[in-house]
Interface confidence: low
């Protein structure tokens, strides 16, 4: 499991003649947002085919109005990363589609209108856990600059996020600071730790302890935008240390917009700008239909008669979720018996059995006593996935090979003295006491 992350650096007119000044106009202010679609492998798939690795939609960028006669500035972009979680192995080779959408905010009846400005696509090789890769793509007269990476979510590690790194109970053969890895237990994994506090959104590192900034960010921890004023918001009390106004609570605090909607403040309240497929005051109403192709992983879309949904996805085996977007967690059904560890490898389930059990689902209880002898007249006892010896008097240890001192546990009560005897132990009781263990 892991996350593919995309950072858009800039979108605007490309170099050369005939480039458009701006996607927005003085008459129609607009703002941009982006959609990324990921597919495994290097196939030239149609844009409409399912985003089998996942898809993500950015927040809306700030509103932009072209000023006639003014030089075209860089277009304001949405904040933050586009993140596409993946549940299984990272394929290493993948195809991507990045769409730039324009949301026109004119006075048209019925709210904002959306239009696709540019679509870029590419095929890449990328190892998980590597540094940010930079890219420039052109679509017609537009140019898009971006960075991307794939990172594993613990406990997954490795270039495909398929190795699980968990501390083992056995002493580690790995050096200091290295973690032992399962299932390849002879491998050791060195965690790449950036400088403490390095921004996870705007910073990255290729060496332990460093913090390198993505374009547009600066500072030792990459937390400072390159060209921002020192003061934040004109709302709230003034800070004694900076003299700047500290933001007080606002209508967008806690983001009242559902389903990935972005919130912007209005003079009286707030306004949600909803992603495609959602609408309503808080983006709470779904407007996705089968025409939008909402079913992933080969799911079949039918118009829902159920009043709670405008469509229903019939998912193929192995997938679930309202959009067939989730691979069925087959391990949640606990198919491995007798305490076996379940591993969902995507193409198959694997059970790692505890000692004493075997079979595809650890269903076979091995004969723990087969070939196991207990010394000195001890008897082998089955159970718990490991053999156990019930030892004859005077012997102990796993195989009854150790001579036991029956007096070691001080069995004689009330100050009685213990004597080891071939048949066991004998207690010589203190005056006034009696019984086999001087208990009376």
């Amino acid at each position: 499991a892991g996350v593919f992350e995309l950072q858009i650096h800039s979108f605007g007119p490309g170099p050369g003649p005939g480039a458009p000044r701006s996607p927005c106009s003085a008459r129609l202010p607009c703002r941009l947002f982006f959609r990324v679609c990921l597919k495994p492998g290097l196939s030239e798939e149609a844009a409409e085919s399912p985003c089998a690795l996942g898809a993500a939609l950015s927040a809306r960028g700030p509103v932009y109005t072209e000023q006639p006669g003014a030089p075209a500035p860089d277009l304001p972009l949405p904040d933050g990363l586009l993140q596409v979680p993946f549940r299984d192995a990272w394929p290493g080779t993948f195809s991507f589609i990045i769409e730039t959408w324009r949301e026109e905010l004119g006075d048209q009846i019925g709210g904002p209108a959306w239009s696709l400005l540019a679509r870029v696509a590419g095929r890449r090789r990328l190892a998980a856990g590597g540094p940010w890769a930079r890219d420039i793509q052109r679509a017609g007269a537009w140019e898009l600059r971006f960075s991307y990476r794939a990172r594993c979510e613990p406990p997954a590690v490795g270039t495909a996020c398929t190795r699980l790194c968990r501390p083992r109970s056995a002493p580690s053969r790995c050096g200091p600071g290295l973690r032992p890895c399962a299932p390849l237990e002879d491998e050791c994994e060195a965690p790449l730790v950036c400088r403490a506090g390095c921004s996870p959104e705007h910073g990255f590192c290729e060496q332990p302890g460093e913090c390198r900034c993505l374009e547009g960010w600066t500072g030792p921890l990459c937390t400072v935008p390159v060209s921002t004023s020192s003061c934040l918001s004109p709302r709230g009390p003034s800070s004694a240390t900076t003299g700047c106004l500290v933001p007080g609570p606002g209508p967008c605090d806690g983001n009242p917009c559902a389903n990935g909607g972005s919130c912007s403040e209005t003079p009286r309240s707030f306004e949600c700008t909803c992603p495609r497929g959602f609408y309503g005051l808080r983006c709470e109403v779904s407007g996705v239909t089968c025409a939008d192709g909402p079913c992933f992983n080969g799911g079949l879309c039918v118009g829902g008669a159920d009043p709670d949904s405008a469509y229903i996805c019939h998912c193929p085996p192995g997938f679930q979720g309202s959009n067939c977007e989730k691979r069925v967690d087959r391990c949640s059904l606990q198919p491995c018996r007798n305490g076996g560890l379940c591993l969902d490898l995507g193409h198959a389930l694997r059970c790692r059995c505890r000692a004493g059990f075997a079979g595809p689902r650890c269903e076979h209880d091995l004969d723990d006593c087969a070939g196991r002898a207990c010394a000195n007249g001890g008897t082998c006892v089955e159970g718990g996935g490991a053999h156990r010896c019930s030892c004859a008097l005077g012997f102990g240890g796993r195989d009854c090979r150790e001579r036991a001192d029956p007096c070691a546990a001080r069995p004689c009560a009330h100050g009685g003295r213990c004597y080891a005897h071939f048949s066991g132990l004998v207690c010589a009781c203190a005056p006034g006491y009696m019984g086999a263990r001087c208990e009376f």
């Epitope: 609408y279 109403v285 118009g303 009043p307 709670d308």
Partner: nanobody, 130 residues
Framework: QVQLAESGGGSVQAGGSLRLSCVAS???????????MAWFRQAPGKEREGVAA????????SYADSVKDRFTISKDYANNTLYLHINNLKPEDTAMYYC????????????????????WGQGTQVTVSS
Amino acid sequence: QVQLAESGGGSVQAGGSLRLSCVASGYPSSTYYMLSMAWFRQAPGKEREGVAAITSGTGSTSYADSVKDRFTISKDYANNTLYLHINNLKPEDTAMYYCAAASGWIVPSRSLTANLYRYWGQGTQVTVSS
């Protein structure tokens, strides 16, 4: 992109009847029933108000209290057309009538809320004289 075109408005005497039509185009006929649709009206100097709605999938209908028992909304799926049958017209029904659509299911209790609809027609004028 869905386009909506209304027709059927006109001038009538109080107590008369009209049938307004709204043809939806630019949307696959096979999924036309997925559109939630509604009629709104706006009288001069007043706010737009929802009068009748029909939700997708279930086809359940909702009406404003002021028009109940006089207005009937219906959908002709074969011709991608929404209708509003108006009986016993009153002078206060005078307004511009707009057809609106949304590509999805809308909670019936909120189906007369204008900002839930993404697509709008240009409107047809209804004038009722006493």
